[in-house]
């Protein structure tokens, strides 16, 4: 699987999850998030050669098409597969609120 | 929606579904598919600016991150959202077989 266990331990050029730390205030301008200051959102990148973690029959077909027609602009793209939530603390006035934001952390990638 | 109805009628530079005809024999080397000879598989391409048909909170965050950090390599990617099946005819020896291949035709895209 193209997950953090594999991708963070290997120098993988092809589609894999990459570490990306986002600081809410500095990177997004979100001053309203009090905790955490930032988090590892991660991201997916790298080429998607034929059959590499193909998401659907279409991505398999497109991968093969791209292999046999290298000049073609059509190819699968490396995108998030499994995502995890992130719990944040913020304030509404003087009242603290805790919320779980879904699909915030990329744990693995796929070719789609 | 970034679907064929919209994308095929507009000159859209950003993420959209694009027409792509694939000939099974010529483009994939699949001699075993007897009908159809080929089909419009289509594909997704184009930049994913902030908030454009964002698939998850992560793609929204990544889009904003990319907007505020233009030098960053991390950005959402334009990939298939809705896919449709394709019915094909092939032969096993002298016996004809009809099969519905799932997720073969891209009908719309998203930024993921």
């Amino acid at each position: 699987a193209l997950d953090t266990n594999y991708c963070f331990r290997n120098l993988e050029e092809n589609c894999c999850v990459r570490p990306l730390y986002i600081d809410f205030r500095q990177d997004l301008g979100w001053k309203w998030v009090h905790e955490p200051k930032g988090y590892y959102a991660n991201f997916c990148s790298g080429p998607c050669p034929y059959l590499r973690s193909a998401d659907t029959t279409h991505s398999t077909v497109l991968g093969l098409y791209n292999t046999l027609n290298p000049e073609a602009s059509a190819s699968p793209c490396c995108v998030p597969q499994d995502l995890e939530p992130l719990t944040i603390l913020y304030y509404v006035g003087r009242t603290p609120k805790v919320e779980q934001l879904s699909n915030m952390v990329v744990k693995s990638c796929k070719c789609s | 929606a970034l679907d064929t109805n919209y994308c095929f009628r507009n000159l859209e530079e950003n993420c959209c579904v694009r027409p792509l005809y694939i000939d099974f024999r010529q483009d994939l080397g699949w001699k075993w598919v007897h009908e159809p000879k080929g089909y419009y598989a289509n594909f997704c391409s184009g930049p994913c600016p902030y908030l454009r048909s964002a698939d998850t909170t992560h793609s929204t965050v990544l889009g904003l991150y990319n907007t505020l950090n233009p030098e960053a390599s991390a950005s959402p990617c334009c990939v298939p959202q809705d896919l449709e099946p394709l019915t094909i005819l092939y032969y096993v020896g002298r016996t004809p077989k009809v099969e519905q291949l799932s997720n073969m035709v891209v009908k719309s895209c998203k930024c993921s």
Epitope: - | K31, H34, L89, Y91, V92, G93, R94, T95, P96
Partner: antibody
Framework: EVQLLESGGGLVQPGGSLRLSCAAS????????MSWVRQAPGKGLELVAD??????????YYSDSVKDRFTISRDDSKSTVYLQMNSLRAEDTAVYYC??????????WGQGTLVTVSS | DIQLTQSPSSLSASVGDRVTITCRAS??????????MHWYQHKPGKQPKLLIY???NLASGIPSRFSGSGSGTDFTLTISSLQPEDFATYYC?????????FGGGTKVEIK
């Protein structure tokens, strides 16, 4: 260009044997089923014998009229299909065509070879 | 085995005529939307030639005056304007199941 060249036809006495050969070129012989179709004088086309590719275990078919007397075989290394005809009868007199069916239709045909069974 | 019955068994026509030949199968030769019926032309001393495959698809190099239609058990070969070189015997053939069989043929003669 697809070419199918039959050979081996001729005059033979009832009860005798003949071996027809069909040398193929111009296509991926290994991938496709090959057939022998005959036309007896004044009659229509009849599929006599058929052999599919190695992918499908060289499965064979014979019409009832030739079963247990004719044997179809193929040599993929030589791109050749054969029809061994034993215990020949007068009613086997016909032009025998070698043909290839990539799908459900017989797309290409040889010129045919005449087999005459007569005393 | 699936039997194919062609009609008529022979016909006389003139150059320029529209000719229709039918082929009826003893059971359906269609599967899903695919119609597994094919048509051939056979002239004396020559090998048969594929005209139409899967009911309505024109084979490579065949003139557009030939067309095919039908589904299920009933199929038609049409020659829109008969030409001198079209006088021949025409056969249908199915590939719905093994064994594939041919129709008895339709001989098109000069009137």
């Amino acid at each position: 260009e697809v070419q199918l060249l039959e050979s081996g036809g001729g005059l033979v006495q009832p009860g005798g044997s003949l071996r027809l050969s069909c040398a193929a070129s111009g296509f991926d012989f290994n991938s496709y089923g090959m057939s022998w179709v005959r036309q007896a004088p004044g009659k229509g086309l009849e599929l006599v014998a058929d052999i599919v590719s190695k992918t499908y275990n060289y499965t064979t078919y014979y019409s009832d009229s030739v079963k247990d007397r004719f044997t179809i075989s193929r040599d993929d290394s030589k791109s050749t299909v054969y029809l061994q005809m034993n215990s020949l009868r007068a009613e086997d007199t016909a032009v025998y065509y070698c043909t290839v069916a990539p799908g459900g239709s017989f797309d290409y045909w040889g010129q045919g070879t005449l087999v005459t069974v007569s005393s | 085995d699936i039997q194919l019955t062609q009609s008529p068994s022979s016909l006389s026509a003139s150059v320029g005529d529209r000719v229709t030949i039918t082929c009826r199968a003893s059971q359906s030769v269609s599967i899903s939307r695919f119609n597994l019926m094919h048509w051939y032309q056979h002239k004396p001393g020559k090998q048969p030639k594929l005209l139409i495959y899967r009911a309505s698809n024109l084979a490579s190099g065949i003139p557009s005056r030939f067309s095919g239609s039908g589904s299920g058990t009933d199929f038609t070969l049409t020659i829109s304007s008969l030409q001198p070189e079209d006088f021949a015997t025409y056969y249908c053939q199915h590939s719905r199941e093994s064994p594939w069989t041919f129709g008895g043929g339709t001989k098109v003669e000069i009137k």
